[in-house]
Interface confidence: low
């Protein structure tokens, strides 16, 4: 049953004399393994014998007989799948049909393969894309329907006979589907490649030429142009004439339109290959080119830079930077349209020529206020001198200058006055917007240039102001020199160092902390009575009568200041003691009599002692001696003694008379 044999292999194989052929082949015999294989050349079926006749190139049988031809032909297959064959070398007369006679135990099959062997190596075939455009990458393919393991070959690309630089990718196929060798070349053709010959050359392993295929490149491209100008350097003066000519060196396909452009903008009504410019003006300076279009697109020539020369135009000045800060650096740039460029410049400051400044730029490394003003310049080239433009203003900014603090009041200033100060300055840029004052007082301090100090203090010594724009400038402090009455007047005891005892020598000092003006007078007062006009008050021998409240006054031309009252205390032993009797010095017996020891002492008496007419001390120590009931025997003279920390004093005798009561007299 022939349907059981399935073969796969290329239908036709190609080779040339002396090369080799490799026939990839697979089969399937479902009923069993291959028993016998014969390779026929141009087999013919003989009906009489029911066998195939023809040249046997290879035979594999059970008995193992191998014809001599088998050295050239090799069966590389197996008994159930592979039927690959190799013929090496292959000859011209091997062309025709190869018949593979396959036999298994029960089945037979004849499979035919075409072999085309040429006398010489046949050429490869170059495949091109349908259209090639300049600068667009294309792939060129060179295909050869040949590949054989025993005969290595190579495909080389040539452009106008010269090997191409681009790397080609070669691939081979030896499969049951196809047998070929292919070379692919990626290539970005330029317009100059148009019409050039590309060759794919087949070479053997040693690089020997075998065959080739050639094609002519048809590279579509925009028109390629050349521009010519008279005069050739394209430098003219106003009023001259200029001619430009456009030549097409290549175009594929043919060009259709022509136009001219200046600085990228199309010139109207200029559609010929010649551009005539008559009596040119400086505005016609610029970059000219011609543009020619075809179906691919527009092509442009190189640009011609037409320079129409003219004298400098009125100049302008650019300042880097204004406003400028005093002490900073500033650069001035003179800008003037001219062709050729100016070679010399003249600079002016406030209309006056700046000597030695001939460059396009003027650099001032350290700006001062007097540099402010208008800067202008004049440019000059070979065709003439330009006009001076309007100029530019340099604004120089600086802190307020010569700041002074000025006292507006008539002098002298007295404590308690309202003082007005102003902050003055000579110049400032930008203008002063605020003021600062030092020290920071409790007064209301405006941000303005006038400071009012209400009720000025005696201790306000110096004031300074600052005028501020972007910076603050401080004035030197001014002294207010406030005049005031003497301050902190007080009485101070100089001697004795300890407490004052009666009889001591005593000195009191009138002190004050400060006075402006310094010339002062002193006054001492006790109980409203003037005692002296010196700074000290002296007592040679103090007596208790000198004790009391003392004040001193210090005055100057502004006013006088009193001290606080100072109490002078004199310590003395008890004195002027006397015994007083109540209700009197004559008392009736049985009544009550009180004796009081009166004294003058500082400090007060701390201890009393009572004595009778016999100088006998009585057991009583208080200031009062109470006799109740009083008896006639109590009659007599009494005296008392007082004691303090300074000493003792005694009273004179005082007599108490106690008389009998009527009752007593009645009883007698």
């Amino acid at each position: 049953d022939s349907s059981k044999w399935v073969f796969e292999h290329p239908e036709t194989l190609y080779a040339w004399e002396g090369a080799c052929v490799w026939i990839p082949c697979t089969y399937r015999a479902l009923d069993g393994d291959l028993e016998s294989f014969i390779l026929f050349h141009n087999p013919e079926y003989n009906k009489n014998t029911s066998k195939f006749d023809g040249t046997r190139l290879y035979e594999s049988t059970k008995d193992g007989k191998v014809p001599s031809e088998q050295k050239r032909v090799q069966f590389l297959g197996d008994k159930n799948k592979n039927c690959t064959l190799s013929i090496h070398p292959v000859h011209l007369n091997d062309s025709g049909q190869l018949g593979l006679r396959m036999e298994s135990k029960t089945e037979k099959w004849m499979e035919r393969i075409h072999l085309n062997v040429s006398e010489r190596p046949f050429p490869p075939h170059i495949q091109l894309p349908p259209e090639i455009q300049e600068s667009q990458e294309v792939t060129l393919t060179c295909l050869l329907n040949f590949s054989c393991y025993g005969y290595p070959i190579q495909l080389q690309w040539l452009l106008e006979g010269v090997p191409m630089r681009q790397a080609a990718v070669t691939s081979t196929s030896l499969t049951i589907k196809s047998v070929f060798t292919r070379s692919e070349l990626k290539f970005s053709p330029q317009w100059s490649h148009h019409g050039k010959i590309v060759t794919c050359q087949l070479q053997d392993a040693d690089g020997k030429f075998l065959s080739n295929d050639t094609v002519q490149l048809n590279v579509k491209h925009t028109p390629k142009l050349e521009i010519k100008v008279t005069p050739s350097d394209a430098i003219v003066r106003e009023g001259d004439s200029v001619t430009m000519t456009c030549e097409v060196s290549s175009s594929n396909p043919e060009y259709t339109t022509v136009s001219w452009l200046k600085d990228g903008t199309s010139l109207k009504k200029q559609n010929t290959f010649t551009l005539n410019l008559r009596e040119v003006t400086k505005d016609q300076s610029g970059k000219y080119c011609c543009q020619v279009s075809n179906d691919v697109g527009p092509g442009r020539s190189e640009e011609v830079f037409l320079q129409v020369q003219y004298a400098p135009e009125p100049s302008t000045v650019q300042i880097l930077h204004s406003p400028a800060v005093e002490g900073s650096q500033v650069e001035f740039l003179c800008m003037s349209l001219a062709n050729p460029l100016p070679t010399n410049y003249t600079w002016y400051h406030n209309g006056k020529e700046m000597q030695g400044r001939t460059e396009e730029k003027v650099h001032i490394p350290k700006i001062l206020p007097w540099h402010a003003g208008t800067y202008s310049c004049v440019a000059e080239n070979i065709l003439g001198t330009g006009q001076r433009g309007p100029g530019a203003e340099l604004d120089v900014q600086y802190p307020p200058k010569k700041v002074t603090t000025v006292i507006q009041n008539p002098m002298p200033i007295r404590e308690g006055d309202t003082v007005t100060l102003s902050c003055n300055y000579n110049s400032s840029n930008p203008s002063v917007t605020r003021y600062e004052w030092k020290p920071h007082g409790a007064w209301e301090e405006p941000s303005l240039g006038v400071l009012k100090i209400q009720n000025v203090g005696w201790d306000n010594t110096t004031i300074a102001c600052a005028a501020c724009n972007s910076w603050c400038s401080w004035a030197s402090p001014v002294a207010l020199n406030v005049q005031y009455a003497p301050r902190d007047v007080r009485v101070r005891k100089i001697k004795p160092l300890s407490e004052i005892h009666s009889g001591n020598s005593v000195s009191l000092q009138c002190d004050f902390s400060s006075s402006h003006p310094k010339e002062v007078q002193f006054f001492w007062e006790k109980n409203g009575r003037l005692l002296g006009k010196e700074s000290q008050l002296n007592f040679d021998s103090i007596s208790p009568e000198d004790a009391g409240s003392y004040s001193c006054w210090v005055n100057n031309s502004i006013g006088q200041t009193a001290s606080k009252a100072w109490t002078l205390e004199v310590l003395y032993a008890p004195r002027r003691l006397r015994v007083s009797m109540s209700p009197g010095d004559q008392v009736m017996e049985g009544k009550s009599a009180t004796l009081t020891c009166e004294s003058d002492a500082n400090p007060p008496v701390s201890h009393y002692t009572w004595f009778d007419w016999n100088n006998q001390s009585l057991p009583y120590h208080s200031q009062k001696l109470r006799l109740e009931p009083v008896k006639v025997q109590h009659s007599g003279a009494y005296w008392c003694q007082g004691t303090n920390s300074v000493g003792k004093g005694r009273s004179p005798l005082s007599t108490l008379t106690v008389y009998y009561s009527p009752e007593t007299i009645g009883r007698r």
Epitope: P323, Q397, P430, S431, V432, T433, R434, K438, H440, E444, E445, P446, S447, L448, G449, C468, N469, S470
Partner: antibody, heavy 121, light 113 residues
Framework: EIQLQQSGPELVKPGTSVKVSCKAS????????MYWVKQSHGKSLEWIGY????????RYNQKFKGKATLTVDKSSSTAYMHLNSLTSEDSAVYYC??????????????WGQGTSVTVSS | DIVMSQSPSSLAVSVGEKVTMSCKSS????????????LAWYQQKPGQSPKKLIY???TRESGVPDRLTGSGSGTDFTLTISSVTAEDLAVYYC?????????FGGGTKLEIK
């Protein structure tokens, strides 16, 4: 970018003191005066005073003399406000504000995020 | 010290409405030397630091929308918002920097209905 980063919230006892800091970045610390502003809860703003970091000069609102002391540490670009003898009246948010007078005499200003001080026993 | 008084203390408006708030100073803030009014307006949104909107009484800080306009001279000043948006919810303070100590107004609280 100019920033003023103030110290975190403070809870302190009456009679004690507190020091609020304000760290400046993104500019020359000595060019801007550092102002301090008080905002009591739900109330308006009160100007405490300022310090000039360049020379340490200070100016106080009379109301805050003796209460607030302003100082700076130039090396760390930080301004400080020390509040003493604290009472509940001092509970507030305190802001630092950097002010620079430009060419026009107009004050550019940048504010800190504020520091909350709460005085409670 | 210069006393700054603002009115009203609060107001509630709908989005799109026009609003004006007033600020009065106890003495003139106009400096004759440069004819500038030393007055600024600040906006303080909830939980944020104050932000300066206007200085010299009428000059807008960069980035401040032209819906906000400052006007006035001497002692009477006004801040106007021509068409209120939800973004404008804040307290607005005026401040004088004519004389030390600088002082602020009590503020006007703007609420959105």
């Amino acid at each position: 970018e100019i920033q003023l980063q103030q110290s975190g919230p403070e809870l302190v006892k009456p009679g004690t003191s507190v020091k609020v800091s304000c760290k400046a970045s993104g500019y020359d610390f000595t060019r801007y005066n550092m102002y301090w502003v008080k905002q009591s809860h739900g109330k308006s703003l009160e100007w405490i005073g300022y310090i000039d970091p360049y020379n340490g000069d200070t100016r106080y609102n009379q109301k805050f003399k003796g209460k607030a002391t302003l100082t700076v540490d130039k090396s760390s670009s930080t301004a400080y406000m020390h509040l003493n003898s604290l009472t509940s009246e001092d509970s507030a948010v305190y802001y630092c504000e950097a002010i620079y007078y430009d060419m026009e005499g107009y004050a550019l200003d940048y504010w800190g995020q504020g520091t909350s001080v709460t005085v409670s026993s | 010290d210069i006393v700054m008084s603002q009115s009203p203390s609060s107001l509630a408006v709908s989005v799109g409405e026009k609003v004006t708030m007033s600020c009065k100073s106890s003495q003139s803030l106009l400096y004759s030397n440069n004819q500038k009014n030393y007055l600024a307006w600040y906006q303080q949104k909830p939980g944020q630091s104050p932000k300066k909107l206007i200085y010299w009484a009428s000059t807008r800080e960069s980035g401040v929308p032209d819906r906000l306009t400052g006007s006035g001279s001497g002692t009477d000043f006004t801040l106007t918002i021509s068409s209120v948006t939800a973004e404008d919810l804040a307290v607005y303070y005026c401040q004088q920097f004519y004389s030390y100590p600088w002082t602020f107004g009590g503020g006007t609280k703007l609420e959105i209905k």
